[in-house]
């Protein structure tokens, strides 16, 4: 299981305000069992963007269907991007734990920059 890698192929993505941003992430293995979460920023103050395990995130949709049992594509689409969404986004794999899941491995991050809406 130590061989699992979280791959974020894009170092940076640039999106016009009002458009959608696709942030790519794949895992190289189904093991260990546990959810993927997306965060903006790193460290204790990071902002949760999407949690595969819990909740509904209205601006975020997954590119693939995560209910399919062998899915390893955890890319997300964030709608209606604004300048406030700029930052570095991390795709993070968690290992199932009790009582709480444990952070296992993070992708290298994708920097999202927001261009002014074309006039």
């Amino acid at each position: 299981e130590e061989g699992l890698q979280v791959i974020q192929p894009d170092k940076s993505v640039s999106v016009a305000a009002g458009e959608s941003a696709i942030l790519h992430c794949t895992a190289t293995s189904l093991i260990p069992v546990g959810p993927i979460q997306w965060f903006r920023g790193a460290g204790p103050g990071r902002e949760l963007i999407y949690n595969q395990k819990e909740g509904h995130f209205p601006r975020v949709t997954t590119v693939s269907d995560l209910t399919k049992r062998n899915n390893m594509d955890f890319s997300i689409r964030i709608g209606n991007i604004t300048p406030a969404d700029a930052g570095t986004y991390y795709c993070v794999k968690f290992r199932k734990g009790s009582p709480d899941d444990v952070e296992f491995k993070s992708g290298a991050g994708t920097e999202l920059s927001v261009r002014a809406k074309p006039s």
């Epitope: 959810p35 949690n51 595969q52 395990k53 819990e54 909740g55 509904h56 209205p58 949709t61 997954t62 269907d65 995560l66 209910t67 399919k68 199932k96 009790s98 009582p99 709480d100």
Partner: antibody, heavy 120, light 107 residues
Framework: QVQLVESGGGVVQPGRSLRLSCAAS????????MIWVRQAPGKGLEWVAS????????YYADSVKGRFTISRDNSKNRLYLQMNSLRAEDTAVYYC?????????????WGQGTMVTVSS | DTVLTQSPDSLAVSLGQRATINCGAS??????MHWYQQKPGQQPKLLIY???NLEAGVPSRFSGSGSGTDFTLTISSLQAEDVAVYYC?????????FGQGTKVEIK
Amino acid sequence: QVQLVESGGGVVQPGRSLRLSCAASGFTFSDYGMIWVRQAPGKGLEWVASISSSSSYIYYADSVKGRFTISRDNSKNRLYLQMNSLRAEDTAVYYCARRYYGFNYPFDYWGQGTMVTVSS
Amino acid sequence: DTVLTQSPDSLAVSLGQRATINCGASKSVRTYMHWYQQKPGQQPKLLIYSASNLEAGVPSRFSGSGSGTDFTLTISSLQAEDVAVYYCQQSNEPPYTFGQGTKVEIK
């Protein structure tokens, strides 16, 4: 094997309260989101409320918002539905069901249901 | 809210024949449509998840298709034990909603 057993149903007068319970066994309860769904006599299924695995995310149907409260105790493997200010239209069989992981997942196991009758 | 409309409301099919149930959504639910079977006096049972995936233990005569707003549940060769009410349900966004149900009987 997976088991969900509801209890706490019965006959209650309008305006009164009732607390339903769902005892879970045969799986790791704390891994699953849980749902209450109801079915009025001779009618279809209506989602009532859902709660995520750690209780961080809770949603209610508009028809019960402000009157019903869903909760869970992962240490006891139990799901609850506190029903206040009951109305005649709340009369139904109440089912608990489990949902693996996040919001988009289906309800893969259901209990047998408990009947709630609201009548004066 | 996403309204789900099933058609027909009831369906009588001869044993061994194909039964088809449709579910239309008032807006796209992507592939997050699930199908349940409810036999008289029993709790619902998951048959198909995410439009086309057969739940473990469900006979292969059941299949699902569709995406977006139009979905279909097909029973390729109806058996006596398939007499039930079938419901579609979306999990694309809250609130979760169900179709009104389709009653399948033997002709």
